[in-house]
Interface confidence: low
């Protein structure tokens, strides 16, 4: 004795990415010598058994048996979303519905609002926007490996009434370590299946210079040639250098090159040297105390840096 449910067809809801292919499968245990039929949300018959009813080359027959009717829809569009009905024309007619949800793929995000010539301690605000997602995507920000906490994602319906444009902004104070950093806006959405869809904005930060004096060789001796390199860092890189020997009033101005050269070291060269590195962002003075060692082979570390 067959129960009434044996003639009730069953199917399942399906989710498909726009442009993808969805398979609609309808099954029935007892077909009562009747054929299965699929129709679309507009109630147009797609297939009746193995007979195509709608001229749409995207729709193909996958399986047609007395117990199953499966069809595929390729290149699915957002307009294809809705309830598809599987019917079996028993007495009475029995139906099962499959909700096809079409995911809209978010476009690659666009970052706007970057202003060049950021200075250290300035506040930067960047905006990010991505259109075409369904349901609405989520945007996240990061700077290198560090997550940035932007505003909550704002959602706006696209003109097509089906997809969404999402936007977010992030505000942060820049430091010299941020010079050359990439600020990345990533879009997170189920249609991407974990794939990364992001846009980066490289930022430049202007900051005051620093400098360090490096002796070459590191342990200078009497009679040797010595180069004191004034290594300036900054953005922009320091273009002007001024070497002075301390102790004389005014300090003895020696050269405006980045390296101070002693062709043949004398004991009288001992003393404290200052290098001022200058860019249009400011100046920085580094010091180095030179103690000229005897020409013996025993290394000494009596030279000191400031």
């Amino acid at each position: 004795n067959l129960s009434q449910d044996d003639s009730q067809p069953w199917t399942s809801d399906e989710t498909v990415v726009a442009g993808g292919t969805v398979v609609l499968k309808c099954q029935v245990k007892d077909h009562e010598d009747s054929s299965l039929q699929w129709s679309n949300p507009a109630q147009q018959t797609l297939y009746f058994g193995e007979k195509r009813a709608l001229r749409d080359n995207r729709i193909q027959l996958v399986t047609s048996t007395p117990h199953e009717l499966s069809i595929s829809i390729s290149n699915v569009a957002l307009a294809d979303e809705g309830e598809y009905t599987c019917s079996i024309f028993t007495m009475p007619v029995r139906t099962a519905k499959s909700l096809v949800t079409v995911l809209g793929i978010p476009q690659k995000p666009i970052i706007t609002g970057y202003k060049s010539s950021l200075r250290e301690k300035d506040t930067a605000t960047l905006n990010c926007q991505s259109s075409g997602s369904k349901p609405a995507a989520r945007l996240t920000w990061r700077k290198g490996d560090q997550e940035l906490h932007g505003e909550p994602t704002r959602i706006q319906e696209d003109p097509n009434g089906k997809t969404f444009t999402v936007s977010s902004s992030v505000t942060f104070q820049v430091t010299r370590e941020d010079d050359g950093a990439s600020i990345v806006c990533s879009v997170n959405h189920e249609s991407l299946k974990g794939a990364d869809r992001s846009t980066s904005q490289r930022i430049e930060v202007l900051y005051t210079p620093t400098a360090m004096i490096r002796p070459d060789p590191p342990h200078p001796r009497e009679g040797q040639k010595l180069l004191l390199h004034c290594e300036g860092r900054g953005n922009p890189v320091p273009q002007q250098y001024l070497w002075e020997k301390e102790g004389s009033v005014p300090p003895l101005k020696m050269t405006q090159e980045s390296a101070l050269i002693f062709p043949f070291l004398n004991k009288s060269d001992s003393g404290t040297y200052g290098c001022t590195a200058t860019s249009n962002m400011g100046s920085y003075k580094a010091y180095y105390t030179l103690n000229v060692n005897d020409p013996s082979p025993v290394p000494s570390s009596s030279s000191t840096y400031h």
Epitope: T101, A136, E157, G161
Partner: nanobody, 124 residues
Amino acid sequence: QVQLVESGGGLVQPGGSLRLSCAASGRTFSNYARGWFRQAPGKEREFVAAIDYSGGSTNYADSAKGRFTISRDNAKNTVYLQMNSLKPGDTAVYYCAAPASRRPSWDADGYDYWGQGTQVTVSS
């Protein structure tokens, strides 16, 4: 501009009933799922009930099963929450929410649009 407006809250005695309404404007919401959440003072927002776009699929929190009924009238772009046998523990602000999707979700992260909420107080 999308707007969800809840109404129907108020003060009711234990064992009493209330019917909350959630009217949507600014877009066609009939194609989208809808959910009700609530937040009691000092507690996190919690799921109450949800309904899919057609009204054919509903889901309830354990605390709402058998007492609350969610329904919708797509012609009026409105979703309802019929609450019977109310208890003091049901006291909370009740929020209506809609996802940018046809599918109902059972957690707050699945919803993109939220109403301002309506206060329900159950007290004798």
